[in-house]
Interface confidence: medium
């Protein structure tokens, strides 16, 4: 807290300019009018105040706007944003994407801070949903943003926003998140032709059910092993050897290198050995010839 002291004669600030960087903290407090500061916030970005001086300027704005800063001030906070606490930011009502971009720019190159997370939360809640432009902006600054959301939060993403998602944005998503995103992606890309559709949907396939994988196997998509290994195990298990062969196309020989890893390992255990042998890859561990395979799930459904 800066003590209230009278401004020395001739030092009253008429505008926010370079002379203020030589003011002591108490002089800034005494000589800079908060309303003047609010209207000339854009200048603060360009004048290299010390971090301690910024504390004083923040204090003045806090006194002027105890209920939270107006967006006209927020948009021009610049590096003063780094001084804000999550509690400060929760008082704000940020509606402009330009304001969001301006503040994310300040934090660019750094990890997502609690301040930024709070800012994004306030912005998205204010908009009601994660629209395409917002998602575009957030993933540009933080590629992992989408995967930091809970499945419940992801449910508010409209299918139209999925067009903004790049493959790298999904790198850290877990299966529960992909379960939510996949149906949205399927809806978003439904009018595309086969090969174009596959290129777009590929990153989301970790949330695809068996029937969709079966359908893809009929379309000569040549799925790569990296994508196959990210599929849900429960979605892969019911696929036949012929379906997996069609799904992977020339990449099928990569199964040998992955035979000890899920979902390939579990899938092999469900296939007849003679079917696996048709692949000519030397995959072992299938059901020996002559054994009867009981589909227990079907049996339970009938009883």
């Amino acid at each position: 807290e800066v003590e209230k002291t009278a401004c020395p004669s001739g030092k009253k600030a008429r505008e926010i300019d370079e002379s203020l960087i030589f003011y002591k903290k108490w002089e800034l407090e005494a000589c800079v009018d908060a309303a003047l500061l609010a209207t000339q916030m854009d200048r603060v970005n360009a004048i290299p105040f010390t971090y301690e001086q910024l504390d004083v300027l923040k204090h003045k704005l806090d006194e002027l706007y105890p209920q939270g800063y107006p967006e006209s001030v927020i948009q021009h906070l610049g590096y003063l944003f780094l001084k804000m606490s999550p509690e400060d930011i929760r008082k704000w009502n940020v509606t402009s994407l330009e304001t969001l971009k301006a503040l994310l720019e300040v934090n660019k190159g750094h990890e997502m801070s609690p301040q930024v997370a709070t800012l994004i939360d306030r912005f998205v809640k204010g908009r009601g949903q994660l629209d395409k432009d917002t998602l575009d902006t957030l993933t540009a600054f933080y590629p992992g943003y989408l995967c930091s959301l809970s499945p419940e939060e992801l449910s508010s993403v409209p299918p139209s926003s999925i067009w903004a998602v790049r493959p790298q944005d999904l790198d850290t998503c877990d299966p529960r998140q992909l379960d939510v995103l996949y149906p949205k992606a399927r809806l978003a890309f439904q009018n595309m032709n086969g090969s174009e559709y596959f290129v777009k949907i590929q990153s989301f396939l970790g949330g695809a059910p068996t029937e969709d994988l079966k359908a893809l196997s009929q379309q000569n998509v040549s799925m790569d092993l990296a994508t196959f290994m990210k599929l849900r195990t429960d979605a892969v298990l019911p696929l036949t050897v012929a379906e997996v062969q069609k799904l992977l196309g020339p990449h099928v020989e990569g199964l040998k290198a992955e035979e000890r890893h899920r979902p390939v390992r579990d899938w092999i255990l469900r296939q007849r050995q003679d079917d696996l042998d048709t692949l000519g890859l030397g995959l072992q561990g299938g059901i020996p010839n002559g054994y009867l395979v009981l589909d227990l799930s079907m049996q339970e459904a009938l009883s």
């Epitope: 290299p48 971090y51 301690e52 001086q53 660019k108």
Partner: nanobody, 118 residues
């Protein structure tokens, strides 16, 4: 620690031009602004130009507005001051300075002399 080294000063005639350079080294990931200051004999230090590190926002006092231009090259860790239409009153030692995000410390170069005289 941040080290700043200026170069490009010298003697120039009124109306002439000079380009000052400042090379930054050390821990500059938290840099938020860089500026050029000057100090004439018997006078205090004055800011003549500054540039924000996260955008291209620049600032100039009225005394140099339109004549001086500050720019930066992040890849080379350089900051430049292009000075045109120089006047006798621009004679001073020019210092490059840096301010950091996380601290209130200033980092200063050693300075480079600029003399404007016929």
């Amino acid at each position: 620690e941040v080290q700043l080294v200026e170069s490009g000063g010298g003697l120039v005639q009124p109306g002439g031009s000079l380009r000052l350079s400042c090379a930054a080294s050390g821990s500059i990931s938290d840099l938020y602004a860089m500026g050029w200051f000057r100090q004439a004999p018997g006078k205090g230090r004055e800011l003549v130009a500054s540039i924000n590190s996260f955008s291209d926002i620049t600032y100039y006092p009225d005394s140099v507005e339109g004549r001086f231009t500050i720019s930066r090259d992040n890849a080379k860790r350089m900051v430049y001051l292009q000075m045109n239409s120089l006047r006798a009153e621009d004679t001073a030692v020019y210092y490059c300075a840096a301010r950091m995000i996380k601290k209130g410390f200033d980092y200063w170069g050693q300075g480079t002399q600029v003399t404007v005289s016929s």
